[in-house]
Interface confidence: low
Amino acid sequence: DAHKSEVAHRFKDLGEENFKALVLIAFAQYLQQCPFEDHVKLVNEVTEFAKTCVADESAENCDKSLHTLFGDKLCTVATLRETYGEMADCCAKQEPERNECFLQHKDDNPNLPRLVRPEVDVMCTAFHDNEETFLKKYLYEIARRHPYFYAPELLFFAKRYKAAFTECCQAADKAACLLPKLDELRDEGKASSAKQRLKCASLQKFGERAFKAWAVARLSQRFPKAEFAEVSKLVTDLTKVHTECCHGDLLECADDRADLAKYICENQDSISSKLKECCEKPLLEKSHCIAEVENDEMPADLPSLAADFVESKDVCKNYAEAKDVFLGMFLYEYARRHPDYSVVLLLRLAKTYETTLEKCCAAADPHECYAKVFDEFKPLVEEPQNLIKQNCELFEQLGEYKFQNALLVRYTKKVPQVSTPTLVEVSRNLGKVGSKCCKHPEAKRMPCAEDYLSVVLNQLCVLHEKTPVSDRVTKCCTESLVNRRPCFSALEVDETYVPKEFNAETFTFHADICTLSEKERQIKKQTALVELVKHKPKATKEQLKAVMDDFAAFVEKCCKADDKETCFAEEGKKLVAASQAALGL
């Protein structure tokens, strides 16, 4: 229903605190380089304006769209041209082109300093001195580094962030209380950001139909007792929510997400028996809980799928009458029976089914043509099963660090043109699939592993899109959303790659490596490993292991030396020479 003033409507629905937080997130996600103080000033101006509209919806400019209001506000930033370059050209456009222009300039890998965590006492003092500013700063720093972070979920993270400081800053051992909580929030936040990035990529690169198919499959697995019509309604609403958030319409997104949570809880009897606990929580926790809720039990005695989708003489008639509805029903029925399959596998099966019907419904004898369609599913199911089995065995044999290294070598040989930091980041995340998923029983391994890999490979795709360097990456990323992982898995060593020139500087290390955390030291070693493979793509596993072995020994030796810097200089030269000899460089 139309409101005279959209900004007043959203302010009243969300309340001042959430309104201000969401506007701050929106602005920080668009203007990622702007200082915190500038954003706070803009947010306060927008909030004051919204209050005038609440008081009188007919007041001047209150009838303008949120995009117009927010875009006008962003375009008042004095340093737009010098800070953002061509993004300033967006301001010459009219809505909706202006907002589209801002969206296109969102940077998945902004050139921002790494967030360094201050001492616990320093953080607690800042929290007590000005709690509101402290929490706003958190929203700002996360939003500008993750321009697609799911805004209503970021409010949930901020609530937990505040709770952690409230509890721990008065604890006897502040650090012991606070640091594990902050680590958990950081890791969960990165995962949440990456999952949402895939949803936005799905909508923006492959369209609403692709996203809806994903949602049908996932919600059918989660709510197998719900009827198809119910699942379809939830899919439509969920698609609207994510379209809004991915499009920068954060106020509408948060409002609609709250409405969806309310609807789900009011209708939980016809959706899922697992929702009771979630629905007793406050709004932010409730929405998060619903999004993460475990799959409900499958209804007993579900009939065979073949009856309606293969044996029935009406298959082509039903398909022709409403193609997407019929395919949606197929996907719903298959997914609710298979919580043990990944969503992407279910979508591959649905695609195969669709292709078969397209071909067979135009054939002389359609039924005979599609009678064996389920046989075509077998290899599609076995491929991820075998891959996961092999990789979990490798993970169990090697442990996480060495498993990551195996993947680093594998992926560097596949796509050596990709930047070293991207290969390290992506391969490390791919390697985490082992500890995340291999502990699960068979029935949970595939949905855990393959859907996680989809999220990680999307990180590779969005980072590569910013500066494309490999046709193979572009091909795997753009041809089919659901076949990205099989596409990357199928890549062999890139025989066209011309090895990188050997540069001793790349393998020069200093005493600062000794004070790094274990994780940072691993990243240094893994960076060196990628560079080695780029210099010598045909190096055998044994050669690489030997060089990495000596590298680790060199680091350990020099970090124990009295004069560390001299050791790194002298031993480093020896190491480079030995490595060149070992690899035949």
Partner: nanobody, 123 residues
């Protein structure tokens, strides 16, 4: 099947010497870093020394520096531990271990283990 067989242990007087050997079979010896660990009765197992695949890098625990020397012969698939100026506190069962990567000290980084050979330093 991978086997690591230690030998050379025994009873020796304080100040004396022993040479332990560890013969490896069933693995590509030159692809493994090798280490010696020891475990005294009622104590945790600790890494004493280790040597990289090519023999270019060695690690010695502070307690044995200057007294123990590790070496390897890749053609013979054997690693040696020369122990001089032995002390009563060196009494322990000595284990030979192989690691796919240079290992920085944790036991779990070593992939294969021998059965151990007992060294007793006593007057």
């Amino acid at each position: 099947d991978v086997q690591l067989v230690e030998s050379g242990g025994g009873v020796v007087q304080p100040g004396g010497s022993l040479r332990l050997s560890c013969a490896a079979s069933g693995l590509t010896f030159s692809s493994y870093a090798m280490g010696w660990f020891r475990q005294a009765p009622g104590k945790e197992r600790e890494r004493v020394v280790s040597i990289s695949r090519g023999g270019g890098y060695t690690y010695y625990a502070d307690s044995v520096k200057g007294r123990f020397t590790i070496s390897r012969d890749n053609s013979e698939n054997t690693v040696y531990l020369q122990m001089n100026s032995l002390r009563p506190e060196d009494t322990a069962t000595y284990y030979c271990a192989a690691a796919r990567y240079w290992a920085t000290g944790s036991e779990y980084e070593f992939d294969y283990w021998g059965q151990g050979t007992l060294v007793t330093v006593s007057s």
